[in-house]
Amino acid sequence: MKVLQEPTCVSDYMSISTCEWKMNGPTNCSTELRLLYQLVFLLSEAHTCVPENNGGAGCVCHLLMDDVVSADNYTLDLWAGQQLLWKGSFKPSEHVKPRAPGNLTVHTNVSDTLLLTWSNPYPPDNYLYNHLTYAVNIWSENDPADFRIYNVTYLEPSLRIAASTLKSGISYRARVRAWAQCYNTTWSEWSPSTKWHNSYREPF
């Protein structure tokens, strides 16, 4: 049993890091493998992650972490029974994928303006809370070409757009994702989309 693609990990910079790797053949990840991880810190304890299958030869493990900060560095050991298959390290702050924003809502009660709001996925005491910027994707269910991205570079998790910039009388969907420049993160996953009917009326 050998590792074909070494584990690569990303952190949500809050409580979970996800590691993925590929074996050289079909593997029952949860019964055959264990990923041990330990913070390189005084008094830290070793933890064991039981991986799940991710395709025939792929495995994924969700590592639970406390109080993630930029100085943290973890040792990773991938075991198959008594055999050490791979040894590495992981610094969460250097591989951040933010959590997806939630609670995306479209407020249509102001006739000529659409207000989109969503929730910041981090608590106020997390460093990313004040450092996320967002991209809002709006598209028409009727017209695949009617697809637009709005970059929200301010901290407030909201976006105002004129209803007149969208076609009237048709349904639209929106979703939002986040990233943080300070840690050079990847984009988060998209939030669940929300749907509304754009009933903007042109003034006579």
């Epitope: 810190f41 005084l42 008094l43 830290s44 304890e45 406390d66 109080d67 900060v69 930029s70 100085a71 005491d125």
Partner: antibody, heavy 116, light 111 residues
């Protein structure tokens, strides 16, 4: 919000022991290390040691080895610092402070006076 | 236990800018991150800066931190009378043993 509530002031005789408590609330108690730091009157901050509330393991500054014991009670989310063989130079305010590499939150402090 | 060196006192007028230095021999500052704490008279220390230059939520951007080599600096702009306090730098060291040294402390007087 995070709160670290410390026990009240103590007056002790030289040679005695003191046990200071620090009750935590507003966060997951076992997810954050706790430090103890002291400050003698008019002096600076001095690190005494650290405890991992999850397993209870500890590490102490060399200066206090053999005299200090840090413990925790997860059922009450409380950490304790006991200092024995007290001498007059142990008169200080003793702080608990939550954090790992740095101290995010501090208790208000407990004044321990050692006097004959 | 190693100690980090700070100037005993600094002073400046309201609205001015002040800097407080923190230097450490050995490996402490050079290999680690620096934090800064503010201690107002009669109160517990409060975290101002961590990770050399990051501010916890609620700390105004008048406070800034930087690090170069084995020394670090705390900057305070737009000084206010309420900034009058003792300021301590802190870090951690892992050699020969783990420890958390603090600076000697700097008394800031707002004239």
């Amino acid at each position: 919000q995070v709160q670290l509530v410390q026990s009240g002031a103590e007056v002790k005789k030289p040679g005695a022991s003191v046990k200071v408590s620090c009750k935590a609330s507003g966060y997951a108690f076992t997810s954050y290390y706790m430090h103890w730091v002291r400050q003698a009157p008019g002096q600076g901050l001095e690190w005494m040691g650290i405890i991992n509330p999850r397993g209870g393991s500890t590490s102490y500054a060399q200066k206090f080895q053999g005299r200090v014991t840090m413990t925790r009670d997860t059922s009450t989310s409380t950490v304790y610092m006991e200092l024995s063989s007290l001498r007059s130079e142990d008169t200080a305010v003793y702080y608990c402070a939550r954090g790992k590499y740095w101290m995010y939150d501090w208790g208000k402090g407990t004044l321990v006076t050692v006097s004959s | 236990q190693s100690v980090l060196t700070q100037p005993p006192s600094v002073s400046a007028a309201p609205g001015q800018k002040v800097t407080i230095s923190c230097s450490g021999g050995g490996s402490s500052i050079g290999n680690s991150y620096v934090s800064w704490y503010q201690q107002l008279p009669g109160t517990a220390p409060k975290l101002l800066i961590y990770d050399n230059n990051k501010r916890p939520s609620g700390i105004p951007d008048r406070f800034s931190g930087s690090k170069s080599g084995t020394s670090a600096t705390l900057g305070i702009t737009g000084l206010q009378t309420g900034d009058e306090a003792d300021y301590y730098c802190g870090t951690w060291d892992t050699s020969p043993v783990w420890e958390w040294p603090f600076g000697t402390g700097t008394k800031l007087t707002v004239l």
